[in-house]
Interface confidence: low
């Protein structure tokens, strides 16, 4: 039970005090007791419960006619059962006794009031009165946890606006309200109570720029909401009528958790005694609600796809046809960014990452816009953000970034358990340098900080700086699987490719050609590839780099070798000994449920079938996956990207609720 104030009683004159239902009020009966008195008794109105404890050891007794020794070891506490109909209608009488004096009486007139600030602390999607049930001032994780949740109101319900909803002080309509969390102030007081008392709603100054609170006028349109707390207003005096009254507030977060903001916001209601205008306002009671701002959550390839994004560029009609067919098979919506809007920037994966935010009452997809800011710069903000589709960005918006800040370098694993620790929403994966040095690249610290601060998908730094482009999607992918952990990790594997080519040569196919059917591309015989010492050395280095990540992924995701599938792939080292794919990089695939869009490798055709395609099918089809090989050679591959780099996917949010995990 919440602690109330301390009330001092004195025999000289009656004491008047306020007691808030659900709080424990201490009675100081000693400090003003008559000098010669040695004991006391208490009588109270039926609406007041008095507890007397005399310790140690504490002997508890509710009031009766007993007398108690008057010493500091006696604790007297009051609680009230019902709110008062009129001021001071509950009475407590203390009688002091001494050996030589007649009893001396002290009177206490109590006013019982109900004041409670309620939010959805049980995370059911509904606000229930919580008085004396749970402590709302703490926020705890886990299925038995408690605490309310706020969404950053980062969508744009007003299509005529260019800003996010949280960037204005207005409530647009009921759609806008649904992105906010309801908080209710319930009061029950005597009619004249607020002539001498005031309620103040306030937020810590350190948190005022992270939240905005609107007060709703009950029964009126949402447009009657007015802002009461926010970046300019840390406190607000409430006009509350006496009697029984409920007041609704709608709360929106303005910032995601980040390195300087752990995501917790406390809203407090304070009851002030303003009866003596000569004295400062005295705080009689406080009630608080702690909210946690919902984190931005990424979705792995194992989540069902809902929408596919790609770019229309010069001469990629066939590519788009293939992606369209695949999207139709997977029953996905398809959004194409036209040429005039992408300004020849086809790398949809690099520009953005689509995740979501969730509260018990609402789930919202949110696009995380990378700071790479090339031709697709405006696409996330102009075409993706909208009603019920949020937006967030981090990092410098003008320069100061590297290729590792593009979101082909940002992936997330499916849910995993690692040495007993559960990651029910998976773990974020991004590429980094192997060790810091003058010429190494890394993801911008602002991006790293943001990803870590979300708390629910603890990031793992992989090593991708060995690649020319430097993105993790160039050597790994995840696909759904019906068994084991529910997925497989796919890793690009030069070792597996050399093994395959060697087998083909042993069977007499050494003359078979890589790149057959591609105009203006020098074709290569299997036997020449196998005898090319430089290429072998290049791929030996690449293999070591991928093995490095393999070990890291096994350790950080709790994987066994049987959870990993090696996809045959060769690389070549270019400028500064950085690697790029030797033929279309098959691991850089589009995963739409069981439908996979894989870069067509143009491998050696043996018995009428590409041996690389055949190998990949033999590895993935037993998992119930369907492989479609997409020709991206001239439109994507020679520009150092593939199918995954050129597409993006919005996926279904996890059914698991993030607040039920323990980070």
């Amino acid at each position: 039970m919440a602690q109330g104030t301390l009330i001092r009683v004195t025999p000289e004159q009656p004491t008047h005090a306020v007691c808030v239902l659900g709080t424990l009020t201490q009675l100081d009966i000693c400090s003003s007791a008559p000098e010669d008195c040695t004991s006391f008794s208490i009588n109270a109105s039926p609406g007041v419960v008095v507890d007397i404890a005399h310790g140690p050891p504490a002997k508890k007794k509710s009031t009766g006619s007993s007398t108690w020794p008057l010493d500091p070891g006696v604790e007297v506490t009051l609680t009230m059962k019902v709110a008062s109909g009129s001021t001071g209608d509950q009475k407590v009488q203390i009688s002091y006794y001494g050996p030589k004096t007649p009893p001396v009486k002290a009177l206490l007139y109590l006013t019982g009031v109900e004041i409670s600030l309620c939010a959805d602390i049980t995370r059911t999607g509904k606000v229930k009165p919580t008085r004396a049930v749970k402590d709302q001032r703490t926020w705890t994780w886990g299925p038995c946890g408690q605490g309310a949740i706020l969404l950053v109101n980062c969508d744009r319900d007003n299509l005529e606006s260019s800003a996010m909803d949280c960037e204005d002080d207005e409530v647009l309509d009921s759609e806008d309200l649904q992105d906010m969390s309801l908080m209710t102030l319930s009061t029950k007081t005597p009619k004249d109570f607020f002539t001498n008392h005031t309620l103040v709603l306030h937020v810590a100054r350190s948190e005022m720029d992270k939240v905005r609170v609107f007060q709703a006028t009950r029964g009126k349109l949402s447009s009657k909401c007015s802002v009461v707390l926010g970046p300019k207003w840390p406190s607000h005096y409430l006009m509350v009528p006496g009697g029984k009254h409920n007041m609704d507030f709608y709360v929106e977060a303005l910032a995601f958790p980040d390195t300087d903001f752990p995501g917790l916001i406390t809203l407090t209601i304070s009851l002030l005694d303003t009866s003596n205008l000569e004295l400062p306002e005295a705080v009689v009671f406080q009630d608080s609600v702690v909210f946690r701002v919902a984190p931005w959550i990424m979705t792995p390839n194992t989540q069902p796809p809902q929408e596919v994004y790609a770019c229309s560029i010069f001469e990629n009609e066939d590519f788009l046809k293939s992606v369209t067919t695949l999207a139709m098979k997977a029953k996905c919506k398809l959004t194409i960014c036209p040429e005039e809007e992408n300004m020849d920037d086809q790398w949809m994966q690099d520009e953005m990452e689509i995740g979501y935010i969730q509260a018990p009452h609402k789930t919202l997809p949110v696009v995380f816009d990378s700071p790479r800011n090339r031709g697709l710069k405006e696409f996330p903000i102009k075409r993706v953000m909208g009603p019920d589709f949020g937006y967030v960005t981090r990092g410098p918006q003008t320069g100061g970034i590297s290729g590792l800040d593009s979101f082909g370098n940002l992936e997330v694993s499916p849910p995993v358990t690692v040495r007993g620790k559960e990651y029910p929403l998976g773990r974020i994966l991004f590429g980094d340098s192997c060790y810091p040095s003058n010429d190494s690249r890394q993801m911008h610290q602002a991006l790293q900080d943001f990803l870590s601060a979300q708390q629910v998908q603890a990031p793992v730094k992989l090593y991708s700086d060995w690649l020319s482009v430097g993105h993790v999607d160039e050597f790994l992918s995840f696909v759904p699987a019906p068994d084991r952990k529910g997925f497989r990790l796919l890793l690009a594997s030069p070792r597996s490719c050399y093994k395959l080519f060697q087998e083909q040569q042993n069977e007499g196919h050494g003359e078979a050609l890589l790149f057959e059917g591609i105009k203006k591309k020098k074709q290569q015989k299997i036997k020449n590839i196998l005898s090319n010492k430089t290429l072998r050395e290049h791929n030996s280095f690449v293999e070591r780099c991928i093995d490095w990540n393999r070990e890291l992924l096994k350790r950080e995701l709790g994987l066994a070798e049987s959870d990993i599938i090696d996809i045959p792939q060769l690389f070549k080292l270019k400028e500064f000994s950085k690697a790029e794919a030797f033929f279309p990089n098959m691991v850089n695939m589009l995963v739409l449920g069981k439908h996979l869009g894989i870069p067509k490798p143009f491998g050696p055709v043996i018995n009428g079938r590409c041996c690389l395609e055949e190998k990949v099918c033999s590895l993935l089809e037993p998992l119930g996956l369907q492989c479609t090989f997409i020709n991206d050679f001239f439109t994507y591959h020679i520009r150092h990207g593939e199918v995954h780099c050129g597409t993006n996917v919005r996926r279904k949010p996890f059914s698991f609720k993030w607040w039920n995990m323990v980070p």
Partner: antibody, heavy 119, light 109 residues
């Protein structure tokens, strides 16, 4: 967890060299960086350099450049640190440690080798 | 090179008390590549915290690292008898110029 076993204590004369070995077990030697850190009596640790066996590239702290050689033998999972032109202020405990991915962050440490330089 | 300055040099506390150790860097430590080690006499240092705030495997949650840029803190929320030792901070962001702080000795009062 990786276990590291270092060679025994050495007493050396000024101007001579010392070569300390560090044998690794319980992990993939290739996938770790091995770093060398020394600690003079009553002082804080001092980073000397390190090597990633996988890339076979040693890195040396400026202070020791030209005087220290760090090598690794993948076959025996052993790393070596050789320090030349010894002086009395090189008297210290020399530790090898492995670091996993956070490249130069010592995680699992050897027991240390005391090298005393005295005439 | 980045110079790490630890303060105080010695901290005299009783078991159960909170210890707050500071480590200041002469310039910003990129990626928050800063670690904390505990060292007891005659033993090798033991990794407690890396990347400024991540607890190493097996380290009790009474050890907490915080900070970024140039100011870092190690907090031990309730000192246990086995926590009395020397603590070093270490930045590993600027290979090969990697440095350790001078140490803070936490002793029994």
């Amino acid at each position: 967890e990786v276990q590291l076993l270092e060679s025994g204590a050495e007493v050396k004369k000024p101007g001579s060299s010392v070569k300390v070995s560090c044998k690794s077990s319980g992990g993939t030697f290739n996938n770790y960086a091995v770093v060398w850190v020394r600690q003079a009596p009553g002082q804080g640790p001092e980073w000397m350099g390190g090597i990633i066996p996988m890339f076979d590239t040693p890195h040396y702290a400026q202070k020791f450049q030209g005087r220290v050689t760090i090598t690794a033998d993948e076959d025996t999972s052993t790393a070596y640190m050789e320090l030349n032109s010894l002086r009395s202020d090189d008297t210290a405990v020399y530790y090898c440690a492995t670091s996993y991915f956070r490249q130069w962050l010592p995680r699992d440490w050897g027991q240390g080798t005391l090298v005393t330089v005295s005439s | 090179e980045i110079v790490l300055t630890q303060s105080p040099a010695t901290l005299s506390l009783s078991p159960g008390q909170r210890a707050t150790l500071s480590c200041g860097a002469s310039q910003s430590v990129s990626s928050n590549y800063l670690a904390w080690y505990q060292q007891k006499p005659g033993l090798a240092p033991r990794l407690l915290i890396y990347d400024a705030s991540i607890r190493a495997t097996g380290i009790p949650d009474r050890f907490r690292g915080s900070g970024s840029g140039t100011d870092f803190t190690l907090t031990i929320s309730g000192l246990e008898p086995e926590d009395f030792a020397v603590y070093y901070c270490h930045q590993y962001a600027t290979a090969p110029q990697i440095t350790f702080g001078g140490g803070t000795k936490v002793e029994i009062k």
